[in-house]
């Protein structure tokens, strides 16, 4: 005989679940579908990931996202996780927003980002709901820097980057300071491939770095080089 009252709780149909913390009166729900749309936009050594929420929320509002990263070496095709070497604008697990910026990416590396959507019952199934996007980093190469000449009070420095990348650079920024003085530094900007740093102290080592400035932001910086001005006694002008 049918019971005079409805049941206090119902078993969930296949593929639907109640999370342990869900009240018995709550409807059965299921994991979300994958994030609906994912884009990865490269900007120098950064990538901005944006996605839209799953079309099917599974009947729940507690959706969070996780981002994972894989990098692949173009020469060998080998791939591996890159969580240790990149930096996220916020912790990449348990995200509630639908965007994140990933920085410190390496030039000429291929990256694949996976964004997974989860809700309160995702842990009750083995399948995952995710979408992936790949991006190649084409940040400019670090400039190769040379000391062309020096005097007691100046250093002439030149640099180069591969010709195909030169058209992307609108200026170069040369930062220099006395070795041992980390409190103050000087910056020179130039459109050319060389600069003479004047008004320097004799017989002194300077730390010099060159960085390309592109439309996307800063290119990779050069090594920090140590160049030394001539001492007053052994000075021939601009000798190397």
């Amino acid at each position: 005989l049918p019971s005079p009252e409805g049941a206090t709780s119902c078993e969930c149909e296949e593929g639907f679940f109640r999370a342990p913390q869900d009240p018995a009166s709550m409807p059965c729900t299921r994991p979300p579908s994958a994030p609906h749309y994912l884009t990865a936009v490269g900007m120098g050594a950064k990538v901005e990931l944006r996605w839209t929420p799953p079309q099917d929320s599974g009947g729940r509002e507690d959706i969070v996202y996780s981002v994972t990263c894989e990098q692949c070496w173009p020469e060998s095709g080998e791939c591996g996780p890159c969580e240790a070497s990149v930096r996220y604008s916020e912790p990449p697990h348990g995200l509630t927003r639908t965007s994140v910026t990933v920085s410190d990416l390496e030039p000429h590396m291929n990256y694949t980002f996976t964004v997974e959507a989860r809700n309160g019952v995702s842990g009750l199934v083995t399948s995952r709901s995710f979408r992936t996007a790949s991006v190649s980093i084409n940040q400019t190469e670090p400039p190769k820097v040379r000391l062309e000449g020096r005097s007691t009070t100046s250093l002439s420095v030149s640099w180069s980057i591969p010709p195909p990348q030169q058209s992307r650079v609108w200026k170069y920024e040369v930062t220099y300071r006395k070795k041992g003085d980390s409190n103050s530094y000087n910056v020179r900007r130039t459109e050319g491939f060389s600069v003479t740093l004047d008004d320097l102290a004799p017989d002194t080592t300077y730390l010099v770095q060159v960085q390309a400035l592109t439309q996307e932001g800063q290119g990779a910086g050069s090594k920090v080089h140590e160049f030394q001005t001539l001492s007053p006694e052994g000075s021939g002008n601009l000798a190397v």
Partner: antibody
Framework: QVQLQQWGAGLLKPSETLSLTCAVY????????WSWIRQPPGKGLEWIGE???????SYNPSLKSRVTISVDTSKNQFSLKLSSVTAADTAVYYC?????????????????????WGQGTMVTVSS | SYVLTQPPSVSVAPGQTARITCGGN??????VHWYQQKPGQAPALVVY???DRPSGIPEQFSGSNSGNTATLTISRVEAGDEADYYC???????????FGGGTKLTVL
């Protein structure tokens, strides 16, 4: 080919001063900054400091208050003194030569790679 | 002070490629040097200036460095490559030399 030979006391009591010397054979002593490096048992490498022919030094900040590195250009030798030792100073101590002269034609190499090492001296601090 | 971070251990099968990383803030702007140390021996330089090899070091040792990570790559790994590996840089901000904590390479 440059060779490094080092010597000094291997067993010390706490609060004593560690003293090691490294002799450089071959090569141009005056062109390089000469370093001391240590390695506690089962642990990693730790740079202690460096000296050049004129006695100019640079030290690891964590040891600076206890370290003195000096040079004797007449003998092509440099020495390490570490005062007030404790058991934490127990380690193999190495002297080392950088790969390139410190400065050549205005281009300098601080903290260059070390291509030649001494044989190492095990120093034990124990009461 | 400047810190270099290495994984404590890396395991690889013979004939495979081992990658040992060395992480540090903007390490790409510094020259990174790598050493191999076998038990009871002094360290031996295997790569300098990110990717150059001293004479006598086989081609299977190579290096790269950009951003915040430098990598020592050992291709076609053999049993004789089992050792501890250390990275090293000069920190120009504090004017002192820094070693990574070391990575033990195990050949399975």
């Amino acid at each position: 080919q440059v060779q490094l030979q080092q010597w000094g006391a291997g067993l010390l009591k706490p609060s004593e001063t560690l003293s090691l010397t490294c002799a450089v054979y071959g090569g141009s002593f005056n062109d390089y900054y000469w370093s001391w490096i240590r390695q506690p048992p089962g642990k990693g490498l730790e740079w202690i400091g460096e000296v050049n022919h004129s006695g100019s030094t640079s030290y690891n900040p964590s040891l600076k208050s206890r370290v003195t590195i000096s040079v004797d250009t007449s003998k092509n030798q440099f020495s390490l003194k570490l005062s007030s030792v404790t058991a934490a100073d127990t380690a193999v101590y190495y002297c080392a030569k950088p790969f390139r002269p410190h400065c050549t034609n205005g281009v300098c190499y601080s903290g260059d790679a070390f291509d030649i090492w001494g044989q190492g001296t095990m120093v034990t601090v124990s009461s | 002070s400047y810190v270099l971070t290495q994984p404590p251990s890396v395991s690889v099968a013979p004939g495979q490629t081992a990658r040992i990383t060395c992480g540090g803030n903007n390490i790409g702007s510094k020259n990174v040097h790598w050493y191999q140390q076998k038990p009871g021996q002094a360290p031996a330089l295997v790569v300098y200036d990110d990717s150059d090899r001293p004479s006598g070091i086989p081609e299977q040792f190579s290096g790269s460095n950009s951003g915040n990570t430098a990598t020592l790559t050992i291709s076609r790994v053999e049993a004789g490559d089992e050792a501890d590996y250390y990275c090293q840089v000069w920190d120009s901000s504090s004017d002192h030399l820094v070693f990574g904590g070391g990575t033990k390479l195990t050949v399975l």
